[in-house]
């Protein structure tokens, strides 16, 4: 039904999340999410993953730098809010962004391997 | 935040269960009571896969497994013998069980540790 997530996915506040335990490059992560009819995590705010805020892990999220727009963009083309990650202005624009659910972000080489989070909106 | 699904608001759903992911630290007994007051049980672990999932969500939490003393067996909340290995079981002071990064350990029941609650759908 419209309120259920696929097996092995977490349901929270009308969203479904797949939290990987495997480590992949950013591109591999993006393709794996797409293959499950979802996209790499796009955050609305830093308490979106409140339920796992004590996790120590970093996860690839769906943010990459667009040279064309000279801005960090989510996979759906919307721009990163400057309030989400105060340190984003110092990020290396060649890198991809890994996120820790306590609200911090790191820019790391897109070829590095991290866990990843896919997201699907229920409604 | 919108609310969907069959679990209480601010709980998560996973594999036909609802989980309350606590952030506050309590003793084992306080955790038991807190979960009861939420019409649920202190976290129980049914299989390896669930243990792996919960370890991703939270680095450590009480589970609903205890023993009366080091001479007694580990039991679940419904009195059944608990089959999985619990580390540090030879320490007589540690009679309540904790999930800690993909393994189960014994801990002092009076320690303040994060707790999670669960109820099956």
């Amino acid at each position: 039904d419209c309120c259920s997530c696929q097996e092995k996915w977490v349901g929270y506040r009308c969203n479904c999340y797949f939290i990987s335990s495997e480590q992949k490059t950013w591109n591999e992560s993006r393709h794996l999410c797409a293959s499950q009819k979802s996209s790499l995590l796009q955050l609305q705010n830093t308490d979106e993953l409140d339920f796992m805020s004590s996790s120590q892990q970093f996860y690839w999220i769906g943010l990459s730098y667009s040279e064309e727009h000279t801005a960090w963009l989510w996979e759906n083309g919307s721009a990163l809010s400057q309030y989400l990650f105060p340190s984003f202005e110092t990020f290396n624009t060649k890198n991809c962004i890994a996120y820790n659910p306590n609200g911090n972000a790191l820019d790391e080489s897109c070829e590095d391997k991290n866990r990843y989070i896919c997201k699907q909106q229920l409604i | 935040a919108r609310h969907c699904g069959h679990c209480p608001e601010e709980w998560i759903t996973y594999s036909n269960s609802c989980y309350y992911i606590g952030k506050e630290r309590r003793t084992w007994e306080e955790s038991l009571l807190a979960c009861t007051s939420k019409n649920s049980s202190l976290l129980s672990i049914d299989n390896e896969e669930e243990m792996k999932f919960l370890s991703i969500i939270s680095p450590s939490s009480w589970i609903g497994v205890f023993r009366n003393s080091s001479h007694h067996p580990w039991v679940t909340m419904n009195g059944l013998a608990f089959k999985h290995e619990i580390k540090d079981s030879d320490n007589a002071e540690l009679n309540c069980a904790v999930l800690q990064v993909n393994r189960l350990k014994s801990a002092q029941c009076g320690s303040s540790i994060i707790y999670h609650c669960k109820h099956k759908l």
Partner: antibody, heavy 118, light 107 residues
Framework: EVQLQQSGAELVKPGASVKLSCTAS????????MHWVKQRPEQGLEWIGR????????QYDPKFQGKATIPADTSSNTAYLQLSSLTSEDTAVYYC???????????WGQGTLVTVSA | DIQMTQTTSSLSASLGDRVTISCRAS??????LNWYQQKPDGTVKLLIY???RLHSGVPSRFSGSGSGTDYSLTISNLEQEDIATYFC?????????FGGGTKLEIK
């Protein structure tokens, strides 16, 4: 394998300028940021600044603004550090660093000693 | 600028010891804390970034912890090759700044 090969030691007179080089191998400098770090004798490390070689954008610690300039030549995969109006305070080892993440320094060159003396 | 303080400038330990080196920031740096090792010949290596993430190729005897303003680097089983000076560095706010270093010597 990532390597940063820095130019040799320099002995320069007060008031003069110097240009140090850092040639990268094992990666393309256009794909990252290059930083320079200063270490005076028996002292700690100070971040001077960084360049994005792909577009030439630079950022400096304000205390090195006017003293240091960081250019890069992507065709030779080389970053430079130019220091002007040298004084004894500029006597130090200068390290070029490959950033990888923006805020930590993953790989360091061997360092270049600059001695300012009359 | 954020000031980074390593109160212990030198430290003596025996081989096999567990050694902890600490570092304090003048304000909360949200775990953006990195550790470097500088050998006597001047060679510098990144050990740990973002408080506890081990850089590739770094032995697992090195670990980092901390939060807010207080951070530490632990070497669990000191080896001869660990004799060096250790620097912390904050990556929270430009300009990036380093601690003064802690020189580790063998007893």
């Amino acid at each position: 394998e990532v390597q940063l090969q820095q130019s040799g030691a320099e002995l320069v007179k007060p008031g003069a300028s110097v240009k140090l080089s850092c040639t990268a191998s094992g990666f393309n400098i256009k794909d990252t940021y290059m930083h320079w770090v200063k270490q005076r004798p028996e002292q700690g490390l100070e971040w001077i600044g960084r360049i994005d070689p792909a577009n030439g954008n630079t950022q400096y610690d304000p205390k090195f603004q006017g003293k240091a300039t960081i250019p890069a030549d992507t065709s030779s995969n080389t970053a430079y550090l130019q220091l002007s109006s040298l004084t004894s305070e500029d006597t130090a080892v200068y390290y070029c660093v490959y950033g990888r993440g923006s805020a930590w320094f993953a790989f360091w060159g061997q360092g270049t000693l600059v001695t300012v003396s009359a | 600028d954020i000031q980074m303080t390593q109160t212990t400038s030198s430290l003596s330990a025996s081989l096999g010891d567990r050694v902890t080196i600490s570092c304090r920031a003048s304000q909360d740096i949200s775990n953006y804390l990195n550790w470097y090792q500088q050998k006597p010949d001047g060679t510098v290596k990144l050990l740990i970034y973002y408080t506890s993430r081990l850089h590739s190729g770094v032995p697992s005897r090195f670990s980092g912890s901390g939060s807010g303003t207080d951070y530490s680097l632990t070497i669990s089983n000191l080896e001869q090759e660990d004799i060096a000076t250790y620097f912390c560095q904050q990556g929270n706010t430009l300009p990036w700044t380093f601690g003064g270093g802690t020189k580790l010597e063998i007893k």
